[in-house]
């Protein structure tokens, strides 16, 4: 997180840590973690942790490790032979089904999914919270959770920023309605290592709750604007995937 501040896991109890690759995710119920497809495409058996503000290895030993049962990548995510050259992050969303249910508590609890009503349509200027252990201004990786509050911005703002290390012509980068552009204020942004974490917005119908409006996906340059997977467009896929892959007692 660039331009963020120290955060406590108690305020982001849905935050999941992936250690390989170094990334994030969001707990959405006791059996399921939501993350970005690009986080899990190269590792279908990710090790995940919840409930710890610090990801120092000695701290992780004391936090709750989650074991995956299966990874479900959105069918619209294009799997590439050379993922390093990716210019299309459309449908950057995945679900991880856990082997065992997560025990909830003050440092571990799920984030809501967006509702289907127009109340959950984001407007430019709407504020969302991002969190993670990714790169900061001073460090390659954060040891302790960082967070920042960012406004939603028009997609063109993301398009206007020059990609810092293009793997192809600027025109090759794909921008779709499945993406949210956010940031641009005081240099606050997500960065490498924050991928898959939630862009959390206050629930318009219950101010005590947050919902995952977006997932950290990609960006032209850290510290400018970032692109987030628009979770609202995938609620049907999420619900269907969870229903089809749940045990009878979960139903």
């Amino acid at each position: 997180i660039i331009g963020g501040s120290d955060a406590d896991i108690k305020n982001f109890p849905w935050q999941v840590f992936f250690d390989n690759p170094w990334a994030g995710g969001a707990l959405i119920n006791e059996y399921w973690v939501l993350t970005a497809a690009h986080v899990v495409e190269g590792n279908r058996e990710p090790t995940m942790y919840v409930g710890s503000t610090s990801v120092q290895t000695s701290r992780l030993a004391k936090s709750k490790m989650l074991t995956p049962e299966h990874v479900f990548i959105h069918p619209g995510w294009k799997l590439l032979e050379v993922p390093e050259g990716r210019t299309n992050f459309d449908n950057d969303i995945a679900l991880v089904r856990l082997k065992d249910p997560v025990k909830m508590g003050p440092t571990v609890s799920p984030i809501c999914l967006p509702g289907t009503s127009s109340d959950y349509n984001l407007m430019d200027g709407d504020l969302g919270l991002i969190s993670g252990w990714g790169r900061t201004e001073k460090r390659d990786r954060a040891v302790r959770l960082k967070a920042a509050r960012l406004p939603v911005a028009p997609l063109r703002k993301c398009k206007e920023v020059k990609v810092e290390k293009p793997t192809a012509d600027a025109e090759a980068y794909v921008f779709t309605p499945n993406m949210i552009c956010a940031g641009g204020e005081k240099g606050m942004d997500s960065c490498k290592g924050d991928s898959g974490g939630a862009f959390a917005v206050q629930d318009p119908n219950d101010k005590t709750k947050f919902y995952a409006a977006g997932l950290v996906s990609w960006g032209p340059q850290c510290g400018t604007y970032g692109l987030y997977t628009r979770v609202k467009n995938y609620v049907d896929w999420i619900m269907k995937t969870m229903q089809e892959n749940s045990t009878p007692r979960e139903d």
Partner: antibody
Framework: EVQLQQSGAELVRPGASVKLSCTAS????????IHWVKQRPEQGLEWIGR????????KYAPKFQDKATMTADTSSNTACLQLNSLTSEDTAVYYC????????????WGQGTLVSVSA | DIVLTQTPDYLAVSLGQRATISCKAS??????????MNWYQQKPGQPPKLLIY???NLESGIPARFSGSGSGTDFTLNIHPVEEEDAATYYC?????????FGGGTKLEIK
């Protein structure tokens, strides 16, 4: 399994330049940071710097700022270290290393490349 | 730059005895309650091998006879009981502040 394969030994003339490579297997370099470390014969270890292959964000130790240039090519999963204006002081083994899933230490190292500068 | 001073430069220890290597930093290498001091072992012709990270955490696959302790500016690597295969040069390294720096090394010989 994570592996870092470095290019072969180099014998170069004083004043010349040399480019060393470090090719990774078992992981994408864009997910990590590549560091370079120098070790002169019978001497200790010196950190040269690091590169984030995802965006070429680099950090150099002041001593190597004008001596070394780190680059990375994510399509070939390879990082490179270029050393210029070589002198006998640059005769050393150069290692690449990565964090892996650790935070700030090196569980993974390349086997090293010996650079010998001699007229 | 943070300077790491390792003592002694050279150490000869009898088989089965304890080897203690000290590393003193010119300023604290602690950050957010964690110590960014790591220890490596290097044998001739090989790259360094991580033994201990974050002052006291044993890297996986490293025997429990290796242990690390300390915080702030003073750190110690202990090897007990020393075995033949432990003959090597040991380095401390700080990763708290750029530029990352290494100690000068301690050569351990088994008597």
């Amino acid at each position: 399994e994570v592996q870092l394969q470095q290019s072969g030994a180099e014998l170069v003339r004083p004043g010349a330049s040399v480019k060393l490579s470090c090719t990774a297997s078992g992981f994408n370099i864009k997910d990590d940071y590549i560091h370079w470390v120098k070790q002169r014969p019978e001497q200790g270890l010196e950190w040269i710097g690091r590169i984030d292959p995802a965006d070429d964000h680099t950090k150099y130790a002041p001593k190597f700022q004008d001596k070394a240039t780190m680059t990375a090519d994510t399509s070939s999963n390879t990082a490179c270290l270029q050393l210029n204006s070589l002198t006998s002081e640059d005769t050393a083994v150069y290692y690449c290393a990565i964090y892996g899933s650790g935070w700030a230490w090196f569980p993974y190292w390349g086997q090293g490349t010996l650079v010998s500068v001699s007229a | 730059d943070i300077v790491l001073t390792q003592t002694p430069d050279y150490l000869a220890v009898s088989l089965g005895q304890r080897a203690t290597i000290s590393c003193k930093a010119s300023q604290s290498v602690d950050y957010d309650g964690d110590s960014y001091m790591n220890w490596y072992q290097q044998k001739p012709g090989q790259p360094p091998k991580l033994l201990i990270y974050a002052a006291s955490n044993l890297e996986s696959g490293i025997p429990a006879r290796f242990s690390g302790s300390g915080s702030g500016t003073d750190f110690t690597l202990n090897i007990h009981p020393v075995e033949e295969e432990d003959a090597a040069t040991y380095y401390c390294q700080q990763s708290n502040e750029d530029p990352w720096t290494f100690g000068g090394g301690t050569k351990l010989e088994i008597k």
